[in-house]
């Protein structure tokens, strides 16, 4: 009789990524005996939950039960029934819910625990939901995407797993775009930091790495374009705002009241003398940029080099991987090429915002509005923060690759925080030895 | 091990308040939320509220206008605060824990106090 | 307020015996039901979650089922320790809600 294999021992996990636009449910899965082996997790499941993000809920908390069913209905559907029970479930909140917190912690608490008794309320081991911090995002992204690009192997591999994978063992750096904060996360060339608070020690799979991160809270894409308008309006002569950074022939009405709900445009509030504005665009990239670049204060920096608003920032170093809405709205773009130099970017954007709104609306036809409005910003943004803000040049333009997935796992640092949380990222390289069920000597 | 204890008296005059103290042991009320549940023969069992462990608190809509729940989280304790009391408000009154983070079902319970409401 | 409904107020078994004990929700609960033991003088013992899913330490005779608004809990070899109460719990919507009781007796 022929040897049958013995059914792998498959472990999950759930890591839900509330972010501030909208939150998604991520299953991951790995082989049990291979736990500590690096690039073993892979993703098998996203889940985008429908509707905004939970800091939107704060005067509708009854209605968050509602809003996880059906994604946490899917998780029942994908994870065998017999492995409910040991499969652990993290929320980690990001910068939507570090803004409500600063608004109100008693709001912010509410929200977090009604999040709580939803996600308990099924058979899974739930772990709990939190605020994580701007510096944990940018370190999880980071592991998850050199764990992902096998960069903790210390295996060489004769082949390389993904098209921009070099056959070293140097890490990839991280940039994180979302709705309301940014990160950067790289290994500096320089060990010693000019600014402890950036500086973060890990010791992984046997090899210490000393990382520079940092969160840009408020400057997340969404957050941005409010302050930008907010920043605008106070120079508009009348309720109506000329703006470069949206189509020609596009309008929009704009509540006073909403442009200064967030934080973030605190420092540009003032009274004005309507309650109301009207967007209409005029699709200039030129200004848009110009316009942008008054978002990031350089004229201040109690440091060798700072990015933007005194933050340090030591010389870039190595590759990018550029994620999330970095991705989004590149890949939307059609920019993700590796072959696409920064010039050639910029002159598309160029091209891009000056399209009349009746023609963009006709030429994408399937998407939102809402979203459609806004690429036109959101590219100019992008090249704004990276080559401004991160101080990346035309030359080093080619070391940013825009990343949506590695092996099927999108970038982001869902992946990374349920590695550190369920211990899967060994200090020490684990020993290859031929004993089962990983016993190690 | 895991364990509640309810303290509070065993008499209360209708129209008076009950003030009842659940201490824990074994798990922090930072962790977990913590249920109160009450007893008795005419009405069986009937969920009364919850603290969760942030603070926030939810109340059966029938006890809301006379109900409160407050924790110290340092000293581990659970605070039950009714006003208003009749005779139909005898029973035995328990804390429960949620079995997970903030579920709404319970893996272990307090032995319970009883709770008579007379004059 | 979402009614459980346990039909049998009382249920006579014998050691060795199976038996299975009911719940009916009067609106759809999904699978948010748990069960608890009573024993006389006793505080509940919680043995089920989300309608199947067993605590550690409780014996696997007991066994849970059901999803909308019919629920079972089967005892399997009942066991004289067995004499209890049970009592079926919708977690589906506040007010949370307990079922009536089925007192379990043994011959």
């Known amino acids: 009789t022929q040897n049958k294999a013995l059914p792998e021992n498959i472990k999950y996990g759930i890591v839900l990524d509330a972010g501030s636009s909208h939150t998604s449910l991520y299953i991951y899965k790995w082989p049990a005996e291979k736990e500590n082996d690096t690039g073993v997790v892979h993703q098998v499941e996203e889940c985008r939950v429908k509707g905004p993000g939970i800091s939107k809920y704060v005067q509708k908390v009854n209605e968050i039960g509602i809003y996880l069913t059906d994604c946490m209905e899917r998780a029942r559907e994908v994870i065998p029934r017999s492995q409910h029970q040991e499969t652990p479930v993290y929320l980690g909140a990001t910068a939507g819910m570090r803004l409500l917190r600063m608004e109100s912690e008693e709001l912010a608490d509410r929200v977090l625990d009604v999040v709580e008794r939803s996600l308990s309320n099924y058979p899974f081991d739930f772990q709990g939901a939190r605020i994580i911090t701007g510096q944990e995002e940018g370190a999880y992204g980071w592991i998850t995407i050199n764990y992902l690009l096998g960069k903790f192997s210390q295996k060489t591999r004769w082949f390389s797993i993904v098209p921009y994978e070099t056959n070293n063992q140097e890490t990839f750096g991280a940039l994180d775009l979302g709705g309301a904060s940014t990160q950067i996360t790289f290994v500096p060339q320089n060990q010693t930091t000019e600014s402890p608070d950036n500086a973060l020690q890990f010791r992984l799979y046997g090899k210490d790495y000393n990382v520079y991160t940092h969160s840009f809270l408020c400057y997340g894409k969404d957050q941005a374009l409010w302050q930008k308008l907010a920043k605008d309006i106070q120079v508009a002569s009348n309720e109506i705002l000329r703006d470069p950074c949206f189509h020609p022939g596009y309008k929009k009405v704009v509540n006073v009241s909403d442009l200064y709900k967030t934080p973030c445009t605190k420092r540009f509030e003032m009274t004005l003398p309507f309650q109301q504005f009207e967007i209409q665009g005029i699709g200039n990239y030129q200004q848009c940029h110009q316009s942008v670049l008054e978002l990031f204060n350089t004229s201040y920096c109690p440091y060798s080099q700072c990015a933007f608003n005194g933050i340090f920032l030591p010389p870039l170093q190595g590759d990018f991987g550029a994620f999330s809405a970095f991705y989004f709205v590149m890949n939307f773009l059609n920019l993700t090429s590796e072959k696409v130099s920064q010039e050639k970017v910029t002159e598309m954007m160029k091209k891009f915002c000056s399209q009349p709104w009746e023609e963009i609306k006709t030429s994408y036809a399937g998407v939102k509005e809402k979203y459609l409005s806004e690429y036109c910003f959101s590219g100019t943004y992008i090249l704004s923060l990276l080559l401004q803000g991160y101080h990346f040049t035309a030359d080093s333009w080619e070391h940013i690759h825009f990343i949506g997935k590695i092996q099927g796992s999108d970038a982001g640092w869902t992946l990374g925080y349920m590695l550190n949380l369920t211990n899967m990222i060994p200090a020490e390289q684990p020993l290859s030895t031929p004993l089962s069920h990983s016993t190690y000597v | 091990q895991v364990q509640l204890k309810e303290s509070g008296p065993s008499l209360v005059q209708p129209s008076q308040s009950l003030s009842i103290t659940c201490t824990v042991s074994g798990f922090s009320l930072t962790n977990y939320g913590v249920h109160w549940v009450r007893q008795s023969p005419g009405k069986g069992l009937e969920w009364l509220g919850v603290?969760?462990?942030?603070?926030?608190?939810d109340y059966n809509a029938a006890f809301m206008s006379r109900l409160s729940i407050t924790k110290d989280n340092s000293k581990s304790q659970v605070f039950f605060k009714m006003n208003s009391l009749q005779a139909d408000d005898t029973a035995i009154y328990y804390c429960?824990?949620?079995?997970?983070?903030?579920?709404?079902?319970?893996?272990?319970w307090g032995q319970g106090t009883t709770l008579t409401v007379s004059s | 307020d979402i009614v459980m409904t346990q039909s049998h107020k009382f249920m006579s078994t014998s050691v060795g015996d199976r038996v299975s004990v009911t719940c009916k929700a009067s609106q759809n609960v999904g699978t948010n039901v748990a069960w608890y033991q009573q024993k006389p003088g006793q505080s509940p013992k919680a043995l089920i979650y989300?309608?199947?899913y067993r605590y550690s330490g409780v014996p696997d005779r007991f066994t849970g089922s059901g999803s909308g608004t019919d629920f079972t809990l089967t005892i399997s070899n009942v066991q004289s320790e067995d004499l209890a109460e049970y009592f079926c719990?919708?977690?589906?919507?506040?007010?949370?809600?307990f079922g009536t009781g089925t007192k379990l007796e043994i011959k």
């Open positions: 429960a824990k949620t079995a997970v983070v903030a579920g709404d079902y319970f893996d272990y």
């Open positions: 989300s309608a199947s």
């Open positions: 603290i969760l462990r942030r603070g926030s608190t």
């Open positions: 719990q919708q977690y589906n919507s506040y007010p949370l809600t």
